[in-house]
């Protein structure tokens, strides 16, 4: 049943080319190169990809040809190291080229930049895009892959192929429509939002594997797959977890060809065995490969089997608990996690992992005690506060969201998080708090039974964004502590942070609060970001400001922007009224 055990191939590059086909091969090599060398021009990458593809074709023709027996890391690394401007563009990353495999690839991986210094992608006019699409469809789509991959160096490569397919379909349909813009723009917005979400979700998977190890990822996968496939046997779930771990390890490690190939094999296996996995897979399994894999990854939870026996019988009441645990600790804990998760689609994965950790800690202590059973008899009682904490937090925050609406809820979180970790850069605080605030619209609409898995697992993804951005330029010991101590306790760790009393308020700088007429032409979203940036700066200057004080200043600020954007001489209004606003704000906050 090992889906991924293959015969040894004389030429790995020929094997993957044949398995994936030329189109997917080229797309995946382009993604791989753009994720490693994020600053290189598009044309340079295309040239490298064409060279690799031509070489692969010679190996398909004759697997014994020169260099065809080399590993993909060796071939790709050698190709990347031919880039002439490596030292000037990437600095110390050029030192990677002096290393041998596998150290060279590890070196490239370590230099992936989660926040590369690249210009924001500006969307051209629809007619301009449609002309470019019709003039050279292949280049247009490659450019999409390149631009996404270099900005999201951990984007799940086979899923990016699925996005590119939808991107192409949108242009194919809409560039022929009567109202091109009305057809295309909503589709592009949807792809952009879904793409950002997909990137962030994958980033958490890679962080889980790279920072906390395979065991942590497997535990996450057991919990999630057991919720999704509660009728599947433990053996089946274990097999899927092993295969899924291999797929994500490969993609997170830059082995994109292997990853895409193995993901296709896994989708095939799941569809061939759907009877023993889930009743919800039928529609997914009728789709073409890329859609099929995406559909399986997003499939709804199957119904729980009726009349599942009590968990306590095996994991508390049995006389064999310590014997079973001692015989195979991880298998026993895996069974516990499987049994608990399949019964609780209403819990977040991170909560299930906290429960499993509590159970493990209890067994470690109790199985060494004089009377183990007496010691662990009440272990399930220890779960109650762990379950209630996220339930209460979600209830309170959904009430706040419903009261305030998304924008003001984001502002409440901006203030909360800036007070917790004021050392973090303003753009990061704005980005992360805005995303944290989106949990309201995303999850609060759900019934109670779906709120926690939606909210807490989403918050794990967003807080991981904070962690990876902070890791690049660490400025706060508190952030480092919450990010590194425990993957599953990150959210409770951040929730528990109070105002940082050690923080020395930032010096007041009038320039930070000087605004110009250009704010009037911004989209509503961009205008919100400007205001939220000012709010963060305000809190950094006056961390002890009350909610009421901050609300008053922000209301004044909103009125000021609205007034000046209606004025005949906008720039003069911003200059004059801006000075007054700054003075009034300083007075109101006692700056």
């Amino acid at each position: 049943r090992g889906v991924f055990r293959r015969d040894a191939h004389k030429s790995e590059v020929a094997h993957r080319f044949k398995d994936l086909g030329e189109e997917n091969f080229k797309a995946l090599v382009l993604i791989a190169f753009a994720q490693y060398l994020q600053q290189c021009p598009f044309e340079d990458h295309v040239k490298l990809v064409n060279e690799v593809t031509e070489f692969a074709k010679t190996c398909v023709a004759d697997e014994s040809a020169e260099n065809c027996d080399k590993s993909l890391h060796t071939l790709f690394g050698d190709k990347l190291c031919t880039v002439a401007t490596l030292r000037e563009t990437y600095g110390e990353m050029a030192d990677c080229c002096a290393k041998q495999e596998p150290e060279r690839n590890e070196c490239f991986l370590q230099h992936k930049d989660d926040n590369p210094n690249l210009p924001r992608l500006v969307r051209p006019e629809v007619d301009v895009m449609c002309t470019a699409f019709h003039d050279n469809e292949e280049t247009f789509l490659k450019k999409y892959l390149y631009e996404i991959a270099r900005r999201h160096p951990y984007f799940y490569a086979p899923e990016l192929l699925f996005f590119a397919k939808r991107y192409k379909a949108a242009f194919t349909e809409c560039c022929q429509a009567a109202d091109k813009a009305a057809c295309l723009l909503p589709k592009l917005d949807e792809l952009r939002d879904e793409g950002k979400a997909s990137s962030a979700k994958q980033r958490l998977k890679c962080a889980s594997l790279q920072k906390f190890g395979e065991r942590a990822f497997k535990a996450w996968a057991v919990a999630r797959l057991s919720q999704r496939f509660p009728k599947a046997e433990f053996a089946e779930v274990s097999k899927l977890v092993t295969d899924l771990t291999k797929v994500h390890t490969e993609c997170c490690h830059g082995d994109l060809l292997e990853c895409a190939d193995d993901r296709a094999d896994l989708a095939k296996y799941i569809c061939e065995n759907q009877d023993s996995i889930s009743s919800k897979l039928k529609e997914c399994c009728e789709k073409p490969l890329l859609e099929k894999s995406h559909c399986i990854a997003e499939v709804e939870n199957d119904e729980m089997p009726a009349d599942l026996p009590s968990l306590a019988a095996d994991f508390v009441e049995s006389k064999d608990v310590c014997k079973n645990y001692a015989e195979a600790k991880d298998v026993f804990l895996g069974m516990f996690l499987y049994e608990y998760a399949r019964r609780h689609p209403d819990y977040s994965v991170v909560l299930l992992l906290r429960l499993a950790k509590t159970y493990e800690t209890t067994l470690e202590k109790c199985c060494a005690a004089a009377d183990p059973h007496e010691c662990y008899a009440k272990v399930f009682d220890e779960f109650k506060p762990l379950v209630e904490e996220p339930q209460n937090l979600i209830k309170q925050n959904c009430e706040l969201f419903e009261q305030l609406g998304e924008y003001k809820f984001q502002n409440a979180l901006l203030v909360r998080y800036t007070k917790k970790v004021p050392q973090v850069s303003t753009p990061t605080l704005v980005e992360v708090s805005r995303n944290l605030g989106k949990v309201g619209s995303k999850c609060c609409k759900h019934p109670e039974a779906k709120r926690m898995p939606c909210a807490e697992d989403y918050l794990s993804v967003v807080l991981n964004q904070l962690c990876v951005l902070h890791e690049k330029t660490p400025v706060s010991d508190r952030v480092t502590k919450c990010c590194t101590e425990s993957l599953v306790n990150r959210r409770p760790c951040f929730s528990a942070l109070e105002v940082d009393e050690t923080y020395v308020p930032k010096e007041f700088n009038a320039e930070t609060f000087t605004f110009h007429a250009d704010i009037c032409t911004l989209s509503e979203k961009e205008r919100q970001i400007k205001k939220q940036t000012a709010l963060v700066e305000l809190v950094k200057h006056k961390p002890k400001a009350t909610k009421e004080q901050l609300k008053a200043v922000m209301d004044d600020f909103a009125a000021f922007v609205e007034k000046c954007c209606k004025a005949d001489d906008k720039e003069t209004c911003f200059a004059e009224e801006g000075k007054k606003l700054v003075a009034a704000s300083q007075a109101a906050l006692g700056l």
Partner: nanobody, 119 residues
Amino acid sequence: EVQLVKSGGGLVQPGGSLRLSCAASGFTFSHYQMSWVRQAPGKDVEWVSSISMLGGGTTYADSVKGRFTISRDNAKSTLVLQMNNLKVEDTAVYYCARGFSGNYYRADLGQGTQVTVSS
């Protein structure tokens, strides 16, 4: 290859007892819930009882509750159904099956063992 070899069926009078046994091979027995199902002549397959991987959790059809007991020995990869106070309506071919709650209908039930309750 998955194999489930049953033994212990036979003819018994109402009120009597029988012990069915099933020796499993070809898979990791302890990683599967196990079940007993039965099929009376001209009827659909009916679920009888299931047991969790570790053997502590058990469930029974209402019709056999209090009379039948399911158990397992993971060290020997063996599943047992102890049937007491048998009734005429328990007459059926009994199958042991890998899986729980629905999946056993899809499993290869293999050769069953005949249980006949008659005076």
